[in-house]
């Protein structure tokens, strides 16, 4: 979990800086005796592996790329995101409101821990490690953190249950503004995501080390209570569970009950009237659908490399070195994978939504609020040209599809 | 002034056992983490062990592993060697060394023959 | 185990010309606290080794201005600005980045 364990007695517990957000650098300690570290006096030191040194060096300089790239990146698409979101009425609507909350919660990262790492990276060692500033830092990297990946996970959660939602109550009319229960969810997901963060805020500590008769410090999770200890234990596991496979389960069992929903409402002149409502909206749930893909794909290497170095990777075998290459090589992907993701949500939108497309260039273009004829021509919230029932007063068919604006 | 002063060495033979001292003086013995290297006859310089500050710590090179015990005692500022099993190929002269981020103090040293 | 390799062996130089030793490492010596902890020492003949530049390029106290160390990664150089007859020995190179530390094979240095 982050540089340096213990002090004086490490000899297993150490985690070079697994934060979890992509930027962890939990290999570098964590699977071998780190050399900068002390170790027990009985001096089990194990035989060094080579290639660690080599994996290391190549990737603190690949990774200050690609964080930087995905600093600048993530910046501007995330912050462009939230700028087309705020400043567009119709744009205001469930889904984009769930899409701007993940946007905020990817800003909020990329703004604030990417730097941190990238220093941590660059400069080997804590910022600000002598100093009150420092131990805030240090606290406050893996919350943020933690509460990063909790928003983008239950972000992608909730529009999976909104895209279920969508389908499922057809009867419900609802204007342009974004409803209270995704205003209620957002609130809450944030507030979750805080929570589960909190013990990385308490088990992150400056902790004093030593190296050849100098000491250093660094920010660590350092264990102190019952609590604490447990969480470390089943960190890894905990992370996959609940940052990784259920917001597949969700998308999963969502998009099935969905599916069905649809495949019921087949037939019927109600399905005839709403086929282009309907399109648009199996659109929205494709974007969806594509969000969690990158999500899974970003994440899935980073998780696998944990989950292996948990159960197959033993640190006594004296042939460990090939599998220690192998997963260090596969952490760091996936490290830079998982910070990718951050990033990629606003480029995956511009490529999936031609309504987000047209706003980005637009908005990027400085103009998207004054471009009325884009506004007219293409409509922004996806089914805002209403299906009409002849009966003006029907609200069981007149569906506003605030919803479905995403395409 | 810092001065160290190894003593221990003499001759043993094969399999023997031996242990040598290096007394530190001049400085704070506590706050420096120490080493030991040996240089065979007409050889160049080979680093044997190191002990972290507090002596909880101790690292060995592979030649050595198993066989020699690096150690310390703070209360007399004194560092210790252990050398079991010994061969003819650790026949050296062993400096100690303080540790501050680099070796910047060493003893005059003491020469260990391993010799039936 | 990380091999420190030196070059050239022996040199032999004149009084007040520089002179230059090399060394490389088998692999980057960046240690992760970001130090890269590899040191000069001089063995006068007769005489324990003693430290002239230490983390790469700074000299330790009492070490004449003419020692300057340099280099990154895998390549680190000692440079004498003019040689006195007093820095004849032997050079050694030494990473203390990763267990085992490792010298190098040493670099004799004599006066013309």
């Known amino acids: 979990d982050n540089p340096e364990r213990y002090s004086t007695n490490l000899s297993n517990h150490v985690d070079d800086f697994t934060t979890f957000r992509g930027t962890e650098l939990s290999f570098l300690v964590t699977t071998h005796q780190p050399t900068n570290l002390v170790l027990p006096s009985n001096g089990s030191m194990h035989n060094y592996c080579p290639q660690q040194t080599k994996i290391t060096s190549a990737f603190k300089y690949i990774n200050t790329v690609i964080s930087c790239t995905i600093f600048i990146v993530g910046m501007v698409g995330n912050a462009t995101l939230l700028r087309i979101i705020y400043q567009n009425k119709c744009m205001r609507n469930g889904p984009n409101a769930l899409i701007a909350s993940l946007a905020l919660g990817d800003l909020i990262y990329v703004v604030i821990d990417l730097p941190i790492n990238v220093f941590k990276l660059l400069a080997g060692r804590w910022p600000f490690d002598h100093n009150d500033f420092g131990v805030f830092l240090c606290k406050l990297f893996p919350f943020l953190q933690k509460s990063s990946v909790g928003i983008t996970v239950l972000n992608l959660c909730a529009l999976s249950v909104d895209r279920y939602r969508a389908v499922a109550s057809w009867s419900r009319v609802q204007g342009i503004g974004i409803p209270l229960v995704t205003a209620i969810e957002i609130v809450s997901i944030w507030i979750l995501s805080f929570i589960l963060a909190i013990p990385e805020a308490i088990g992150f500590v400056m902790v004093p080390f030593e190296y050849r008769g100098e000491q250093h410090k660094t920010c660590m999770l350092n264990a102190t209570s019952k609590f604490m200890e447990f969480y470390q234990d089943v960190k890894d596991w905990w992370l996959f569970g609940f940052y990784f496979c259920m917001p597949l389960v969700c998308t999963a069992i969502f998009y099935t009950l969905m599916t069905c929903e649809m495949l019921n409402r087949r037939n019927g002149s109600l399905r005839i009237a709403l086929s282009e409502h309907l399109k648009q909206r199996r659109e929205v749930a494709k974007t969806v659908f594509c969000l969690v893909v990158i999500f899974a794909l970003c994440w899935f290497p980073l998780h696998l490399s944990r989950i292996l170095k948990k159960t197959v990777y033993n640190e006594m075998d004296k042939n460990r070195c090939e599998l220690l290459s192998f997963l260090l090589l596969m952490d760091y992907i996936g490290i830079n994978l998982a910070t990718m993701n951050s990033c990629i949500n606003p480029i995956a939108l511009y490529f999936v939504s031609k309504k987000f497309k047209n706003c980005f260039q637009s908005c990027l273009c400085c103009c998207c609020y004054q471009s009325k004829s884009l506004m007219t021509s293409v409509p922004m919230n996806g089914t805002s040209i209403q299906w009409k029932n002849h009966d003006q007063n029907n609200h069981n068919t007149d569906r506003s599809s605030h919803k479905d604006s995403m395409n | 002034e810092v001065q160290l002063l190894e003593s221990g060495g003499g001759l043993v033979q094969p399999g023997g056992s031996l242990r040598l001292s290096c007394a530190a003086s001049g400085f704070t013995f506590s706050s420096y983490g120490m080493s030991w290297v040996r240089q065979a006859p007409g050889k160049g310089l080979e680093w044997v062990s190191a002990i972290s500050t507090n002596g909880a710590t101790a690292y060995y090179a592979d030649s050595v592993k198993g066989r020699f015990t690096i150690s310390r005692d703070n209360s007399k500022n004194t560092l210790y060697l252990q050398m079991n099993s010994l061969r003819a190929e650790d026949t050296a002269v062993y400096y100690c060394?303080?540790?501050?981020?680099?070796?910047?103090?060493w003893g005059q040293g003491t020469l260990v023959t391993v010799s039936s | 185990d990380i091999v420190m390799t030196q070059t050239p062996l022996s040199l032999s130089v004149t009084p007040g010309q520089p002179a230059s030793i090399s060394c490389r490492s088998s692999q980057n010596i960046v240690h992760s606290t970001g130090n890269t902890y590899l040191e000069w020492y001089l063995q006068k003949p007769g005489q324990s080794p003693q430290l002239l530049i230490y983390k790469v390029s700074n000299r330790f106290s009492g070490v004449p201005d003419r020692f300057s160390g340099s280099g990154s990664g895998t390549d680190f150089t000692l440079k004498i600005s003019r040689v006195e007859a007093e820095d004849v020995g032997v050079y050694y190179c030494?990473?203390?980045?990763?267990?085992?530390?490792?010298f190098g094979q040493g670099t004799k240095v004599e006066i013309k």
């Open positions: 060394a303080t540790e501050k981020g680099a070796m910047s103090h």
């Open positions: 030494f990473q203390g980045s990763h267990f085992p530390f490792t």
